[in-house]
């Protein structure tokens, strides 16, 4: 807390300009009128104020807006956002996908900090649901911020702003995140031809079910092995040894290095070791021929 | 951030010294920068400093001797410092933008005018 002072003759400040980095803070308090600071906060992130005096004019800005900034000094806050608590950020309205873009860009190249993820939070609110170019915008800055979001978070997301997403921005993501995600992606590249949807759905197949395993399986996809260890266990355990075959394709082969992981691990421990040893890669823990199968699962739901 | 000042030393009242601050990113280019100096047992103090759009202004006790300038493409910022006089013995620092703002300073690089 800044000592209220008289400002000394002479230093009043007319404008915000560089001739106040070698303001003492109590000058700064003094001699900067808080609504000249207000209709030029524009220029505060063209001048290097230190630490400190951006406090005093945080500081300002607070008592002249008690309620909360208005959009049009948030939009030019620049790196005195770094300043803010997120219980400052939530008295905030931010509507304009420019104040967005203007303030995430002062956190570029940086974690995302409680800061961001309150500012985020407000924005996605106060807009109703998570649109295709806040999408676009959010993922540019921070490729996870998509797998930060909860299941129920998710299911905000339109099918058209599936467009917008990147392989990469899915890395994180788990599979209750991609069971999610999935359907909203299978509704958005509905329309494209198969080798097409296939490169836009691979890295949505984690919350894939079997049946669209299976049909995929039918379309020579040819999906690599990485693909293949990232779906879903239980959507991998009922396929056949010739779907799995039609659905790798030529990278059927890397089953072999994979044999002891999931899914793959569990996959062959359903599959008969007939069937296995038709792919010729010397895949072991098969069913033992002349091995009666039950479906325990099949057999509760009978009962 | 990393920010590495360089180019400091002994030098006689009235020598010349050119300081260097180099800084991870393209942190210089876009953000206004600031050199400052600590005296020993003093608070440390902005000398001179260039707006994010290009123009320069300096602290009084400097005006006509000191000279701030940088180079966008090696994402450096200088400080020309000539008639060096006593008074300007300091470890001199720079610093601009997200670091500035959170206060986060190199190792600086220490002068001494005698």
């Known amino acids: 807390e800044v000592e209220k002072t008289a400002c000394p003759s002479g230093k009043k400040a007319r404008e915000i300009d560089e001739s106040l980095i070698f303001y003492k803070k109590w000058e700064l308090e003094a001699c900067v009128d808080a609504a000249l600071l207000a209709t030029q906060m524009d220029r505060v992130n063209a001048i290097p104020f230190t630490y400190e005096q951006l406090d005093v004019l945080k500081h300002k800005l607070d008592e002249l807006y008690p309620q909360g900034y208005p959009e049009s000094v948030i939009q030019h806050l620049g790196y005195l956002f770094l300043k803010m608590s997120p219980e400052d950020i939530r008295k905030w309205n931010v509507t304009s996908l420019e104040t967005l873009k203007a303030l995430l860009e002062v956190n570029k190249g940086h974690e995302m900090s409680p800061q961001v993820a309150t500012l985020i939070d407000r924005f996605v609110k106060g807009r109703g649901q998570l649109d295709k170019d806040t999408l676009d915008t959010l993922t540019a800055f921070y490729p996870g911020y998509l797998c930060s979001l909860s299941p129920e978070e998710l299911s905000s997301v339109p099918p058209s702003s599936i467009w917008a997403v990147r392989p990469q921005d899915l890395d994180t993501c788990d599979p209750r995140q991609l069971d999610v995600l999935y359907p909203k992606a299978r509704l958005a590249f509905q329309n494209m031809n198969g080798s097409e949807y296939f490169v836009k759905i691979q890295s949505f197949l984690g919350g894939a079910p079997t049946e669209d395993l299976k049909a995929l399986s039918q379309q020579n996809v040819s999906m690599d092995l990485a693909t293949f260890m990232k779906l879903r266990t239980d959507a991998v355990l009922p396929l056949t040894v010739a779907e799995v075959q039609k659905l790798l394709g030529p990278h059927v082969e890397g089953l072999k290095a994979e044999e002891r992981h999931r899914p793959v691990r569990d996959w062959i421990l359903r599959q008969r070791q007939d069937d296995l040893d038709t792919l010729g890669l010397g895949l072991q823990g098969g069913i033992p021929n002349g091995y009666l199968v039950l479906d325990l699962s099949m057999q509760e739901a009978l009962s | 951030v990393q920010l590495v000042e360089s180019g400091g030393g002994l030098v006689q009242p009235g020598g010349s010294l050119r300081l260097s601050c180099a800084a991870s990113g393209s942190m210089f280019s876009i953000n206004a920068v600031a050199w400052y100096r600590q005296a020993p047992g003093e608070q440390r103090e902005p000398v001179a400093a260039?707006?994010?759009?290009?123009?320069?202004i300096y602290a009084d006790s400097v005006k006509g001797r000191f000279t701030i300038s940088r180079d966008n493409a090696k994402n450096t910022v200088y400080l020309q410092m000539n008639s060096l006089k006593p008074e300007d013995t300091a470890v001199y620092y720079c610093?601009?933008?997200?670091?500035?703002?959170?206060?986060?300073w190199g190792q600086g690089t220490s002068v001494t005018v005698s």
């Open positions: 610093n601009g933008g997200w670091s500035l703002a959170l206060d986060y």
């Open positions: 260039m707006t994010s759009g290009g123009s320069t």
